[in-house]
Structure formats: C-alpha cells, structure tokens
C-alpha cells in the first residue's frame, strides 16, 4: 500500500529521492573503479510521518507503535523501494571489466 | 553483501530483531481483527554503524557519504530483510475470514 504522498511537514521534508554528487575518493572506490570518476548517487532521504509512503503492513504497524512507544519503537525509515542499474568500469586482476550493479542507485523511495 | 555481524557499539545495540507486544487497540485493529487479541510484533531496531549488516552496495555508499556529509546523508537504517507470514482472523461485510499477511512480521534485519 503506497499510502499518502502528501507531506504534512512541508515541501521536500518527507521521504523522497535526492541526488548527491560523489567522487570515487568519497566512495572509497578510487583504487578499483576507472569510470565514472564522479557518481550522481540517488538516495532516499527524508522523514516518514504517519502513513506517508508506507511500504506495507509492517510500516503501518511501526507508525502506530512509534506513536505509543517513541523511545522503544523508531519511526519508519526512508529507504529505496527499487533501484536503477549502473555500469561501472573496474580494475580486475587480469585487466579491466564492465560490471553492472543492480542495487546501487535508488530509483524510488518508501517508508518502512 | 551481508557485511560484519559484530556490533562495535556493544551487545544488542546494533540493528537486530526485537519483539514488541501489542494489543489490537495499540495497532488500531480492534474494529476489524478478532484474533489474535495480542500480537508479538517482530521488528528491526538498532543502530547501523559502518558496514554493519550492509544490505547491498547502496548501503555501503550511504555509509561512506554519511561519514563525509552527516548533515546531508543519513546513516543506513535498520529494516526488515525478510518477513514471516501471519494469519489474522478478521471481520468482513459477510462475516469472518482468515487472512494471511506476508509483510507484517519481520523475520530478519539488515541496514540500508
């Protein structure tokens, strides 16, 4: 259930896709990745207020219990719902290879 | 990549499965669920320090960027890696039905 997409905290404050520019050095990849030298990392950032983009029943339960026991149960968290594949050119023992990663760039976000 | 299962913050402080006892009233289910009247909700709670139970490449990137830009990029978050099914007996318009929910109880946790 992809519940409410309206953010009660104000525009851009709730769970959504953000892009963060990162160099190979930032990512700790400089020794083994040749290209790209800079990555536009898409990630899920933002708050998950009550029922906002609730991923499933578990997220709905978490919201209810967080309201009751905020010190024990954390609020749902903004995480990727799906990913975009990304190709990296990387150094190997035998030379250079093309590697596709299916779990690197967030495509869509939800709260869980 | 299910990275390190050793918690550097001390026993039980990192992302792991917790059980929280909740009544139907707590969950807001009292009007439509007949049984069980109390649910042992298993959920993922705890910190996600560097590379602890990193779910995938995205989680590893998030850790690196959080270290560099803690005000912009949040740390990875402890969420279910898989679920246990749960059967609820629920009230319907025509009577009572048995319903299995596949996304209600966390079975295993990771950081993402």
């Amino acid at each position: 259930a992809r519940n409410g997409d309206h953010c009660p905290l104000g525009p851009g404050r709730c769970c959504r896709l953000h892009t963060v520019r990162a160099s190979l050095e930032d990512l700790g990849w400089a020794d083994w990745v040749l290209s790209p030298r800079e990555v536009q990392v898409t990630m899920c950032i933002g708050a998950c207020p009550s029922q906002f983009r609730a991923a499933n029943m578990h997220a709905q339960i978490k919201t209810s219990l967080h309201r009751l026991k905020p010190d024990t149960v954390p609020a749902p968290c903004c995480v990727p719902a799906s990913y975009n594949p990304m190709v990296l050119i990387q150094k190997t023992d035998t030379g250079v290879s093309l590697q596709t990663y299916d779990d690197l760039l967030a495509k869509d976000c939800h709260c869980i | 990549a299910r990275n390190g299962d050793h918690c550097p913050l001390g026993p039980g402080r990192c992302c792991r499965l917790h059980t929280v006892r909740a009544s139907l009233e707590d969950l807001g289910w009292a009007d439509w669920v007949l049984s069980p009247r109390e649910v042992q909700v298993t959920m993922c709670i705890g910190a996600c320090p560097s590379q602890f139970r990193a779910a995938n490449m995205h989680a590893q990137i998030k850790t690196s960027l959080h270290r560099l830009k803690p005000d912009t990029v949040p740390a990875p978050c402890c969420v279910p890696a898989s679920y246990n099914p749960m059967v609820l007996i629920q009230k319907t318009d025509t009577g009572v039905s048995l319903q299995t929910y596949d996304d209600l109880l966390a079975k295993d946790c990771h950081c993402i």
């Epitope: 400089a30 020794d31 040749l34 290209s35 790209p36 030298r37 800079e38 990555v39 536009q40 975009n84 594949p85 990304m86 190709v87 990296l88 050119i89 150094k91 250079v96 093309l98 596709t100 690197l104 760039l105 | -």
Partner: antibody, heavy 121, light 111 residues
Framework: QVTLKESGPGILQPSQTLSLTCSFS??????????VSWIRQPSGKGLEWLAH???????RYKSSLKSRLTISKDTSRNQVFLKITSVDTADTATYYC?????????????WGQGTTLTVSS | DIVLTQSPASLAVSLGQRATISCRAS??????????MHWFQQKPGQAPKLLIK???NLESGVPARFSGSGSGTDFTLNIHPVEGEDTATYYC?????????FGGGTKLEIK
C-alpha cells in the same frame, strides 16, 4: 548481443538539415553509465566526435559545432537522433553512432557500420 | 580541447616484425592510478574497432600481439609480430574529458 545501426538521407543540398537515427539493441539507455555518441569521418580523413547523449539525458556537444547540433533520444524505442542544421559540403562524411559505457570516462566498445552523407548542390 | 598527435602518419613493417605507433596528448590524461587513453583499428570500409582500453588493457577477442603502454601524455601501441591482416589505420582516443578527441591516425602497411 549489442548492435547499432545508423540511418540517414544519403544526399542533401547545402543549407538543408540533416536528420540521423541510431537504432540499437542489446543494451538500455536507462542504465546509469550508458550513452551513445555520434562520430563522423570525411572520406580518407580522421575521426571527429560530434555529440553525446547519456542515460540521464545529459547532452554534450563539440563546442565549435554546438550551435548546429541537436542530439536526443527515445529510450523506450532504443533510438538516438542527431540533427545538423545548415549543412555544407564540409559535412560530407560517414556518420557513426557508438556506445560509450561506464560514464564520462568510459570507452566506445560498439560502433554502427556508418551511414554516408553527401552534401551536393 | 586535448590535442592528440600520432606518429608516424604512416609506416610499412615487414611480416613478423614489430610495429610501434606513438600518441602524444597536449595535456596529461592520467590519474595516479589509471590512464584514459584507448586505441582503435579501422580497416577500409569498416567502422573502428576497439583494441586497447585505458592505455594497456586488451579488449576481449583482440589478439595478444597487440599491446599498449604509457601514461601522462605519452602512449604507445605495439603490434608484434605483425600479420598481414593488421593492414589498417590506427587511432588513439582519450576519454579524460569532453570533448573526446582522436589522434590523426597512423596507416600501417605490411611489406
């Protein structure tokens, strides 16, 4: 199996607009790091890179030709297009499209067989 | 723009001998770890074919008689031993930045 194939008008008169299509298969332009470039080669001469369209629709052009070039893509149909306005005899060449993998600093691993353009009055 | 200067413009090498082609860049195209220079072979009437990527890495399916070396601004393509089917024009190309540029080409003839 990756393939690319260029198509174009073959012959144009000076001042007309050239429209080229690159149809490809075996990869997707929705994959981060994938892109397609257009490169041309006048008969008996060297290779000249013209333009590039990336997976995220980032478009890059050779600066000296930028005002005349427009690159675009249709991701769902696996096609990349190039338009060159106000063609002249100097634009007579074989036009290639090539896949560039792995981001900006990647390499051209697959090329089409080329389409020949003659500009003549 | 980075200018790539190839030398010689043409060369004739006897069958079984070594062919050496140079490519000089107008600025460095290397980091401390990797070099962003590639080599292509083009036969008459055909599209260019990738031989070497990142200065020294042989593309899959390319015979081991082709090798590349160099860093910074100076790069070399070696073919040894040369075979009859190696008659072609060879181009270097950088991917250091946009615009990508190619060398002027070296025409190899087998004697």
């Amino acid at each position: 199996q990756v393939t690319l194939k260029e198509s174009g008008p073959g012959i144009l008169q000076p001042s007309q607009t050239l429209s080229l299509t690159c149809s490809f298969s075996g990869f997707s332009l929705s994959t981060s790091g994938m892109g397609v470039s257009w490169i041309r080669q006048p008969s008996g001469k060297g290779l000249e890179w013209l333009a590039h369209n990336d997976w995220d629709d980032d478009k890059r052009y050779k600066s000296s030709l930028k005002s005349r070039l427009t690159i675009s893509k249709d991701t769902s149909r696996n096609q990349v297009f190039l338009k060159i306005t106000s063609v002249d005899t100097a634009d007579t060449a074989t036009y290639y499209c090539a896949r560039r993998v792995g981001g900006l600093e990647g390499y051209f691993d697959y090329w089409g067989q080329g389409t020949t353009l003659t500009v003549s009055s | 723009d980075i200018v790539l200067t190839q030398s010689p413009a043409s060369l004739a090498v006897s069958l079984g001998q070594r062919a050496t082609i140079s490519c000089r860049a107008s600025q460095s195209v290397s980091t401390s770890r990797f070099s962003y220079m590639h080599w292509f072979q083009q036969k008459p009437g055909q599209a260019p074919k990738l031989l070497i990527k990142y200065a020294s890495n042989l593309e899959s399916g390319v015979p081991a008689r082709f090798s590349g070396s160099g860093s910074g601004t100076d790069f070399t393509l070696n073919i040894h031993p040369v075979e009859g089917e190696d008659t072609a024009t060879y181009y270097c190309q950088h991917s250091w930045e946009i615009p990508y540029t190619f060398g002027g080409g070296t025409k190899l003839e087998i004697k």
